[in-house]
Interface confidence: medium
């Protein structure tokens, strides 16, 4: 039988009483346009609801726009929009909400054509009251808040002028002119690409790359001839043109750009693109592009400098430059990475990786489905994840796979099961172990999400046909129970809970729509009647992550050390709570040689886990540059992969080698690097 | 039922070697780490090495290491200790102990006696 | 390494008195850490494991607890054959570490 209809399937007691007395409609005074809602701080209860809507009139578009508040998640909103003056905010800014607990937000007003620059409203009181501030410039982005201090503000001008505020946008003040691209690095740094000659576009891959550390007192040039750049974790990388060709190669920084590496990836052309994946303090993915409009490329991951990197998966599929890629990362276990690749037929299947990258295979199939026509062998087949990709080609996928850090070994995702992803309409499926073993959860493709920290999912039917039936599980997906949320049908347009999945409340959005007209609701409910009690230590059970086999001492080993958590049985209804934390026991493994990677001029032939030196490196010059400077690198072969934890077992150890070298790439060396002040 | 026994003991002089064996049945060996632990004649345990299901990972406490190896035989069921140069702190009780990946020392053997002496 | 520092080093007690035992590691250990008993003559035997979970056989009467770096082994009306040597074990890092062991003799 179908998951949710099996006989065991315990039913949860009155809940029809019980939610029908915690669902609190809300019905918006405005004519449907669009709506974006954002949550104002962590477990305050406060989200906004900005509506706008355009009037196309003959010469031109009029707009206008209201704006909502509630403090009880959802329950009740009050139109706040005279704290704005009733002044149209312009929705491709959204709503620029500050970090952690600040309280702050910027909204960006709309001004007439003739005006000399834009209009920002401030609130650092959780949206109570705002303060209107003329700006001195057009605003080309958002506001963007330093993560380190939420009074620092940047922003880039319509001509291309970089931005700071001191105060949280009271008063602004222009630090460079001719910015392409402006980030908030660490330690309040703001790092920027310049153009000399005409513009952005033009100069690309001629760019200079800057760093102030002193919001604009005084800069430092750290990198010439640069393409773009990016942050990840604690690295900084930069694209940068090589002397000769037009190709570009990546260098990488792990000290705010004062010294600079060449990492050893492919160089790149100019149809081809790089991309950081995902990125730690510990190490990177990193996607290059395949010559040609392949649309996929190969995954690499970096030591522990961002520099040495293994080839990890080839053929991914990633489309043109800021394009679609599956790349998932899967939060609620760590080393967990779900993507899709092309294959030589171009159908497309989807891998994952336990080991942050190690080792890529193709999901389990579901114990309780059948292979599909896209399978050649009825028997063996594997679970495909609808992602990114599928969302971009309008198949009938409403949403991306979800997982959560606090609800661990929980990812919920839409899938197909054959030898390839099926443009049939999908099925949702759930792992409770992190992606090792999957389950149909529904059929037919849904909107989820995660509350209490796993301890309730909900789900709504997708569907172009009005709704008004929610569905719920409180047991991780294996039974589910119905609940008619109105009487009256609801165009669905979204579910919103609150970020981190602590909540146990459910907002889901849609409009009615009547002969004269349609106007936005909201029905928040409140399943904590459904969760009577507080959880206790009964109701936990011991789990040990990536275990595969639970007599093997070396079980659930991953980077050297694995993990046991105390996870919610199944079978217990009741409360994690918005205090819940994860308790979680680590504990060090033995080495292996799969705790290593293959450091520079090694690497492993296949279906073997010693590094071997590269047969084409043999008594060659190597190209590697190492902070820019001509100097000898010494290796043993083999370097800890990042993050690994594992003491003892087998340690590795070769002669060490001098890897004599020469610098092909110099110019991001110190020497070249200059400063200045304002 | 789940049982180590120890063998291999005995009285030896300060440099000389000694091999200690553990023999396991009534459980798939092969599956478990396998630990050596010592007890010193004023009570106190030392954990000395251990190995992994395999046989491919071992390590060892700093005291022992580079003079005792531990490996094991899979298909005997059988666990060894091979200890050179043997010194008067090393006399004690060696027991073998089973680990699993849940819980490190849940079995243990009755012992067996290395006195280290001149 | 990590120090396993247990007190008390014995403990007199008699038949249904409620015993404790602490251990405190010398930094945190998360729950890493059993309890063994150890009689004359006999195999030590294993009661509890990560800190709190009673291993299969073991009377209830014994319960851990803590987390971090402090822990505590209760037995909770102690009976004839609880007269033996305790000892605490932390396995979060090689190498494994040994408390010195609590001895509770009749009173």
């Known amino acids: 039988s179908a998951p949710g209809e099996d006989e065991e399937c315990g039913r949860v007691r009155d809940f029809v009483a019980k939610l029908a007395n915690n669902t609190h409609q809300h019905v918006f005074d405005d004519l449907r346009g669009s709506v974006s809602l954002s949550w104002v701080g962590d477990s305050t209860g406060v989200i906004l609801v900005l509506t706008t809507f355009h009037v196309p009139l003959v010469i031109m578009t009029f707009g206008q726009s209201k704006l909502y508040r509630s403090e009880d998640y959802g329950k009740n909103f009050k139109d706040i929009t005279d704290l704005i003056n009733n002044t149209f905010i312009r929705t491709e800014f959204g709503m620029a909400i500050g970090p952690e607990n600040s309280g702050k937000v910027v909204l960006t007003a709309e001004v007439s054509g003739g005006s000399r620059g834009g209009r920002i409203f401030r609130s650092s009181d959780f949206a109570k009251n705002f303060v209107q501030t003329d700006l001195p410039f057009h605003p080309l982005t958002q506001m963007m808040y330093s993560p380190q201090n939420s009074d620092y503000l940047l922003a880039l001008s319509t001509e291309n002028g970089l931005w700071v505020s001191k105060n949280f946008g009271g008063k602004w003040e222009e630090i460079h002119k001719a910015v392409c691209l402006a980030k908030w690095g660490s330690d309040n740094t703001i790092f920027f690409t310049t153009y000399a000659n005409g513009s952005c576009k033009a100069d690309l891959g001629a760019l200079e790359l800057w760093r102030t550390s002193d919001l604009g007192k005084s800069f430092k040039t750290i990198g010439v001839k640069i393409y773009s750049f990016g942050l990840g974790g604690r690295f900084l990388f930069a694209s940068v043109m090589a002397d000769k060709d037009t190709t570009r190669r990546i260098h990488v920084s792990t000290d705010q750009g004062d010294t600079w590496s060449m990492a050893q990836l492919p160089s790149v052309g100019q149809e081809q693109f790089y991309s950081i994946l995902a990125a730690n303090d510990d190490m990177v993915f990193m996607h290059v592009d395949e010559p040609g409009d392949t649309g996929f490329g190969t995954i690499f991951t970096s030591d522990d400098r961002g520099i040495v990197y293994s080839k990890s998966l080839d053929r991914h599929l990633y489309t043109t430059t800021g394009g679609e890629t599956d790349f998932t990362n899967v939060t609620s276990l760590r080393g967990v990475y779900i993507t899709s690749v092309l294959s030589e037929d171009n159908s497309i299947q989807t891998m994952i990786t336990f080991d942050q990258g190690g080792r890529w295979t193709h999901l389990r199939k579901p114990e309780n489905s059948e292979c599909d026509a896209t399978a050649k062998n009825k028997n063996e087949c594997s679970l495909h994840i609808h992602a990114s990709y599928s969302i971009s080609q309008k198949l009938n996928v409403p949403m991306a796979p979800l997982s959560e850090p606090n609800a661990v070994g929980i990812v919920i995702a839409h899938g197909s099961v054959g030898d390839a992803i099926s443009v049939m309409v999908p099925d949702v499926y759930i792992s409770d172990d992190g992606g090792y073993s999957w389950t149909k959860m529904l059929e037919g493709p849904h909107y989820y999400t995660i509350l209490d920290s796993g301890g309730i999912i909900v789900a709504i039917e997708h569907s172009s046909r009005p709704i008004n039936v929610i569905k719920f599980s409180t047991d991780e997906g294996q039974c589910w129970q119905t609940y008619t949320f109105t009487r009256d049908p609801i165009y669905f347009t979204g579910l919103a809970s609150e970020p981190g999945a602590r909540s146990m409340n459910i907002s889901i959005w849609g409009f009615t729509e009547s002969f004269l007209t349609s106007q936005w609701v909201s029905y928040t409910i409140d399943f904590k009647d459904i969760l009577e009690r507080n959880c206790e230590e009964k109701d936990y059970t011991i789990w040990l992550a990536h275990s595969t086999d639970p007599e093997d001492y070396e079980d659930g080993c991953i980077l050297g050390y694995k993990e046991q958590f105390l996870r919610l049985r199944k079978s217990s209804v009741c409360q994690n709570g918005r205090d819940y934390v994860v308790t979680k026991q680590p504990s060090i493994c033995l080495c292996s040689l799969e705790d290593f990677l293959c450091d520079f001029g090694y690497y492993r032939p296949e279906n073997d886990s010693k590094c071997v030196e590269q047969p084409e490196l043999k008594g060659h010059d190597l190209e590697f540059c190492l902070y820019g400077r001509e100097e000898h690198l010494t290796t043993n072969g083999y370097r800890k992969i990042p993050g690994d934890k594992c003491q003892g077992g087998v340690n590795p150890v070769r002669e060490v080698k001098d890897l004599k070298k020469k610098c092909t790439s110099n110019f991001l060396s110190p020497e070249k690097q200059n400063s200045k002040s304002n | 039922e789940v049982q180590l026994v120890e063998s291999g003991g005995g009285l030896v002089q300060p440099g000389g070697s000694l091999r200690l064996s553990c023999a396991a049945s009534?459980?798939?060996?092969?599956?478990?780490?396998m630990s050596w632990v010592r007890q010193a004649p004023d009570k106190r345990l030392e954990w000395v090495a251990i190995?992994?299901?395999?046989?491919?990972?071992?390590y060892y406490s700093d005291t022992v290491k580079g003079r005792f190896t531990i490996s094991r035989d899979n298909s005997k069921n059988s666990l060894y200790l091979q200890m050179n140069s043997l010194r008067a702190e090393d006399t004690a009780v060696y027991y073998c102990?089973?680990?699993?990946?849940?819980?490190?020392?849940?079995?243990w053997g009755q012992g067996t006696l290395v006195t280290v002496s001149s | 390494d990590i120090q396993m520092t247990q007190s008390p080093s014995s403990v007199s007690a008699s038949v249904g008195d409620r015993v404790t035992i602490t251990c405190h590691a010398s930094?945190?250990?998360?729950?890493?850490i059993g309890w063994l008993q150890q009689k004359p003559g006999k195999a030590f035997k294993g009661l509890i494991y990560?800190?709190?979970n009673l291993k299969d056989g073991v009377p209830s009467r014994f319960s851990g607890s803590g987390s971090g770096a402090d822990f505590t082994l209760t037995i909770s009306s102690l009976q004839p054959e609880d007269f033996a040597t305790y000892f605490c074990?932390?396995?979060?890092?090689?190498?494994?570490?040994f408390g010195q062991g609590t001895k509770v003799e009749k009173r």
């Open positions: 102990s089973r680990s699993s990946s849940h819980w490190y020392f849940d079995v």
């Open positions: 009534g459980f798939t060996f092969s599956t478990y780490g």
């Open positions: 190995i992994s299901s395999g046989g491919s990972y071992t």
């Open positions: 930094q945190g250990i998360s729950s890493n």
């Open positions: 990560h800190g709190t």
């Open positions: 074990v932390q396995y979060a890092q090689f190498p494994y570490t």
